[in-house]
């Protein structure tokens, strides 16, 4: 009696579904009463299928509602374990243990990947220095290196920083920033780089004509501008008020003047 595995290594994506398989010999019709199938991962019990019955009482809580033995495959000599919504914690060494007349077991290694596919980007400008801050943020696993390049795909020099934290699902939340001197329509790329082929993801950042967002320093800039505008409005109001006062004084002093004199005065006032 021999259990075989078509694959002993599975690399699966976070959040996807996986089916791992162990084959065992079945002659003619399957005798469920003689069959025992266990699936375990390290010290966690996933499946206990004994004499045609699955015992969910002993199933580890982390696999509840997510793991099932594909019963329709048993008659084909295939003990297939399906796990839905794969978590990072599902990575490890699995054992299928089958007793059917004789007994045997095999090990299967599962690795879980989470590509840094969805890259969020932000561009801001420092008015004081005219320096642009480019920011790329993404979630994935395992650790990725963030590489910044220009439109010629050459590495960019500039002040950079990276922060990494964990999400609730244990993914890595990686944020990388780059401070550069750039002009409108310059193109930059941030690449979340992993050594495995096909695991690199890139976002394109184009420097806008006007800054896409304003950093906190711009607030003082607007306050200053607002203050100047307010000052100008106050000054204009005072001047208008003074003009009215001057006109009233002229009328009181001179009484009725000839037309040419009045026109002259109006012109002078309007030009002030």
């Amino acid at each position: 009696f021999t259990v075989t595995v078509p694959k002993d290594l599975y690399v699966v994506e976070y959040g996807s579904n996986m089916t791992i398989e162990c084959k065992f010999p079945v002659e003619k019709q399957l005798d469920l009463a003689a069959l025992i199938v266990y699936w375990e991962m390290e010290d966690k019990n996933i499946i206990q299928f004994v004499h045609g019955e699955e015992d969910l009482k002993v199933q580890h809580s982390s696999y509840r509602q997510r793991a099932r033995l594909l019963k329709d495959q048993l008659s084909l000599g295939n003990a297939a374990l399906q796990i839905t919504d794969v978590k990072l914690q599902d990575a490890g060494v699995y054992r299928c243990m089958i007793s059917y007349g004789g007994a045997d077991y095999k090990r299967i290694t599962v690795k879980v990947n989470a590509p840094y596919r969805k890259i969020n980007q932000r561009i801001s400008v420092d008015p004081a220095t005219s320096e642009h801050e480019l920011i790329c943020q993404a979630e994935g696993y395992p650790e990725a290196e963030v590489i910044w390049t220009n439109s010629d795909h050459q590495p960019v020099s500039g002040k950079r920083s990276v922060t990494t934290s964990r999400t609730e699902g244990m993914l890595l939340n990686v944020t990388s920033s780059l401070r550069v001197n750039a002009t409108a329509n310059d193109v930059f790329y941030c690449t979340f780089w992993r050594s495995q082929p096909g695991q690199n993801h890139t976002a394109e950042l184009i420097i806008p004509e006007l800054p896409a967002t304003h950093p906190p320093q711009n607030r003082t800039h607007w306050v200053l501008l607002g203050s100047i505008l307010l000052f100008l409005i106050v000054v204009s109001t005072v001047l208008l008020f003074l003009r009215k006062q001057v006109r009233m004084l002229d009328v009181e002093k001179c009484g009725v003047e000839d037309t040419s004199s009045k026109n002259r005065n109006d012109t002078q006032f309007e030009e002030t």
């Epitope: 375990e40 019990n45 580890h60 004789g102 007994a103 045997d104």
Partner: antibody, heavy 118, light 113 residues
């Protein structure tokens, strides 16, 4: 060195439930398979079932509807319950540890004689 | 279930004598994963629990004297004691761990002539 010790009543009434405890020292439940085996008065040995380090259980089909093996890792104990006993269940009951799923019984308790009688 | 048959049930011997006892299984116990036979021998002295002597049909458990030798393959197995000592007077059981449930032979009792 792993040591196992069985304890429980030596006399059980017919139709009642036989309950035994196996206390483990020198090892934890993080590995191995923890078995119950019995030896009948005629010297015949029978493997009854096990509970594994992962909590999975196996019961001999001849006992399936009557047997339950559980554990309490915090107390380093595992338990046997055998319901609806008859005189045929009179035996010396042993707890034993095997290193893996398809390995023999490397460590045994000293055994406890249980008699089923009215 | 795999049936294990042991013979003889009783074996009268003298100290210093060489003895052999037989164990047969109802199906082959050759485990394909390591090409070894899933058979163990136990010794049970009066008033004591069984003690593992031999596993994989021929591998001695640590601390077991080398006068105990296990042999055989497939369905036929033998336990040999090259020179019986007084402390060897016990019941010897063979057991298969090839498939569940694990099953034992009925035992061979080694007695003084």
């Amino acid at each position: 060195e792993v040591q196992l010790r069985e304890s429980g009543p030596s006399l059980v009434r017919p139709s009642q439930t036989l309950s035994l405890t196996c206390s483990v020292t020198g090892d934890s439940f993080t590995s191995g398979y923890w078995n119950w085996i019995r030896k009948f008065p005629g010297n015949e040995l029978e493997s009854m079932g096990y509970i594994s380090y992962s909590g999975s259980t196996y019961y001999n089909p001849s006992l399936k509807s009557r047997i339950s093996i559980t554990r309490d890792t915090s107390k380093s104990q595992f338990y046997l319950q055998l319901s609806s006993v008859t005189a045929e269940d009179t035996a010396t009951y042993y707890c034993a540890r095997s290193e893996g799923w398809l390995l023999p019984f490397a460590y045994w308790g000293q055994g406890t004689l249980v008699t089923v009688s009215a | 279930d795999i049936v294990m048959s042991q013979s003889p049930s009783s074996l009268p011997v003298s100290v210093g004598e060489k003895v052999t006892m037989s164990c047969k299984s109802s199906q082959s116990l050759l485990y394909s994963s390591n090409q070894k036979n899933s058979l163990a021998w136990y010794q049970q002295k009066p008033g004591q629990s069984p003690k593992l002597l031999i596993y994989w049909a021929s591998t001695r458990e640590s601390g077991v004297p080398d006068r105990f030798t296990g042999s055989g393959s497939g369905t036929d197995f033998t336990l040999t004691i090259s020179s019986v000592q007084a402390e060897d007077l016990s019941v010897y059981y063979c057991q298969q761990y090839y498939g569940y449930p694990f099953t034992f032979g009925s035992g061979t009792k080694l007695e003084i002539k």
